[in-house]
Amino acid sequence: LNTTILTPNGNEDTTADFFLTTMPTDSLSVSTLPLPEVQCFVFNVEYMNCTWNSSSEPQPTNLTLHYWYKNSDNDKVQKCSHYLFSEEITSGCQLQKKEIHLYQTFVVQLQDPREPRRQATQMLKLQNLVIPWAPENLTLHKLSESQLELNWNNRFLNHCLEHLVQYRTDWDHSWTEQSVDYRHKFSLPSVDGQKRYTFRVRSRFNPLCGSAQHWSEWSHPIHWGSNTSKENPFLFALEA
């Protein structure tokens, strides 16, 4: 008889729980040891890395990964074709764009090939695991004597992303931040011409196309003020 242990894996939806199936035995054996949890992230919907902590195994083990999509046309079990390694031991699997179907339930199964009954299955909603590339091409426009507008680009559909802008002056100890919706535009209404400003932006796949919690990396910073604004008072887009 199989026993199923449910433990949350951090993916919000209840259908995305982590199912660990083990076979009970008379004495404690390798088959009762839990397998490491698999963490998947979809990078800009270009590729996906599903990784696990290979060092959590009591002895070096080349765990294998299979995946499929639940209740869909893509429900055929697939073997990982591109493993990631850590110290010559499998520690992840990379899937390419054509293998990523965001809005179908992704099922990933980790298995110990030496103990086939020792396996763990997780169900993930990939639209909640997308991490976009960092924003690019930050530009600043001076709309008036005291107003600046920051624009940027993303290598993704604008309406799928929300953004976080941070800015500070050389006199500030901490960043001021402002959320920005899919329109990827930010205005600072009151700029002190005597100060040097630094801006940076990051983006997240939320809330219109998914419910991802993870932000992109920060963009390269862009600077404005005192020693730079004299060079071109209306446009400055040099990345540091």
Epitope: L102, Y103, K125, N158, C160, L208, C209, G210
Partner: antibody, heavy 119, light 107 residues
């Protein structure tokens, strides 16, 4: 089989509000957007807005932003479109249509609900 | 808002003809272009999504091409059931917008 079934025709007076429902079945409701598109008599298609059923986020065309509200009841897989301050030019067939977010088109449509605004 | 302009507005053709409808976007929409067919009194039906991908169940005589701002829907050999109104639709930028439609009539 995917089905979107809309509520019946409505006749309203100018200034009133109308609430049209769209009940979905045959697919995982929360993986989709639901769009609302209207078509005035003899005219083309006009996108009003959409709601992401996986989280409830909405977006509206500027023209409708102050008058339209999209809501969803995930327990019954039903989406609602409420349009307020009706005027005669709102007379149209209103469609709900689902699409997966990202780059997919609207692959299933409701049968349409005729809303007539007349004094 | 992105304007979608279809041409021609109406078109007469015969069964067996090859027909092309064009759609121009007022700014770059990459490949985020869909095509729909609508018959009188009916809801629209998706034909092509993401510029050239055929929706399931749509006959292979329908095809889409183009990129950026200029797109084309081609029907390689018109069938009697193809006489309808066709709309292009951009899914690149909110608000999503439709072309004004092309009415395809029997000659």
């Amino acid at each position: 089989e995917v089905q979107l079934v809309q509520s019946g025709a409505e006749v309203k007076k100018p200034g009133a509000s109308v609430k049209v429902s769209c009940k979905a079945s045959g697919y995982t409701f929360t993986s989709y957007w639901m769009h609302w598109v209207r078509q005035a008599p003899g005219q083309g298609l006009e996108w009003m807005g959409h709601i992401y059923l996986g989280g409830g986020a909405t977006n509206y065309a500027e023209k409708f932003r102050s008058r339209v509200t999209l809501t969803a009841d995930t327990s019954t897989s039903t989406v609602y479109m409420e349009l307020s301050s009706l005027r005669s030019e709102d007379t149209a067939v209103y469609y709900c249509a689902r699409s997966q977010p990202y780059y997919y088109g609207m692959d299933s449509w409701g049968q349409g609900t005729t809303v007539t605004v007349s004094s | 808002d992105i304007q979608m302009t279809q041409s021609p507005s109406s078109l007469s053709a015969s069964v067996g003809d090859r027909v092309t409808i064009t759609c121009r976007a007022s700014q770059d929409i990459s490949n985020y272009l869909n095509w729909y067919q609508q018959k009188p009194g009916k809801a629209p039906k998706l034909l092509i999504y993401y510029k050239s991908r055929l929706h399931s169940g749509v006959p292979s005589r329908f095809s889409g091409s183009g990129s950026g701002t200029d797109f084309t829907l081609t029907i390689s050999s018109l069938q009697p059931e193809d006489f309808a109104t066709y709309y292009c639709h951009q899914g690149h930028t909110i608000p999503f917008t439709f072309g004004q439609g092309t009415k395809l009539e029997i000659k």
